[in-house]
């Protein structure tokens, strides 16, 4: 892969109510099925017109899911993650991982193992600084005048 | 995508006995979930019976329970869907359904993602 990607990892909480139509996504991953180098991780591979997901509109494919009802997803075989999914009744309580693209740069997803990923504070405090010091020489520069 | 073709559907009497045919292609087989779906006229489509990917397990919508087995032979990228003691209520256009990954039950439509076009039980 050409260059540089870089990401904002944000999580959230999602409870969805598996409706008539089903919760409407589907999953890849596993020990037995690694969707991303170095990561067994189950990802969402697939949102589905009207389930609950794409009703809900918070989960979006390529998320990562960390656990189910409380119930962790790490080094799970494939199917053993579909069956806690399916096992996990009408309200669902997702822990999700969202992966934001920050940087112009081939898309893709980030492995566990890759140091790409970087805490939005690492992005802020520079720009921050940077503001901080752009407006002191901007006072220097008038009180000249 | 799965390309899916149906057959064995035909006009049988009641308490006869047909065995549908679902032959697949186009990805591996032997991970899919398999299902079989009814549509019969002016009524809503029906989930009938499903067949899991990775484990085999199958399950079965009440009112054929007992009457209908599903099957899969991985080697011939087919799954089977043998009805015995059929009703005149069996009747309908029978849709065979595969996917992979859902996290839904397999008697949920939206679980998934390619669909025959179906064939035809007449019970009479």
């Known amino acids: 892969m050409n260059g540089r990607v870089d990401y904002l990892v944000t999580e959230e909480e999602i409870n969805l109510t598996r409706g008539p139509s089903g919760l409407g996504f589907n999953i890849v991953g596993g020990t037995d099925q690694q969707y991303v180098s170095n990561d067994s991780g189950i990802y969402v591979s697939r949102i589905k017109e009207n389930g609950a997901a794409a009703l809900d509109g918070r989960l979006q494919e390529g998320d990562k899911i960390l656990s189910v009802n409380g119930q962790d997803l790490k080094n799970l075989l494939h199917q053993d993650a579909v069956d806690l999914f399916r096992n996990a009744g009408y309200a669902v309580s997702l822990r999700v991982q969202h992966r934001l693209q920050v940087q112009n740069g081939p898309i893709g997803h980030r492995g566990e193992g890759d140091p790409s990923g970087i805490p939005i504070f690492m992005v802020l405090v520079p720009v921050f600084a940077l503001t901080m010091v752009a407006a002191w020489a901007f006072m220097r520069y008038r009180q000249q005048l | 995508d799965v390309q899916l073709v149906e057959s064995g559907g035909g006009l049988v009497q009641p308490g006869g006995s047909l065995r549908l045919s679902c032959a697949a292609s186009?990805?591996?087989?032997?991970?899919?979930?398999m299902g079989w779906f009814r549509r019969a006229p002016g009524k809503e489509r029906e989930f009938v019976a499903a067949?899991?990917?990775?484990?085999?397990?199958?399950d079965y919508s009440d009112s054929v329970k007992g009457r209908f087995t599903i099957s899969r032979d991985n080697a011939k990228n087919t799954v089977y869907l043998q009805m015995n003691r059929l009703k005149p209520e069996d009747a309908a256009v029978y849709y065979c359904?595969?996917?992979?990954?859902?996290?839904?039950?397999?008697?949920?439509?939206?679980?998934?993602?390619?669909w025959g076009q179906g064939t035809q039980v007449t019970v009479s």
């Open positions: 186009g990805r591996s087989f032997s991970s899919l979930d």
């Open positions: 067949i899991s990917g990775s484990r085999g397990s199958t």
């Open positions: 359904a595969a996917g992979f990954g859902s996290v839904d039950g397999l008697e949920y439509p939206i679980s998934y993602d390619d």
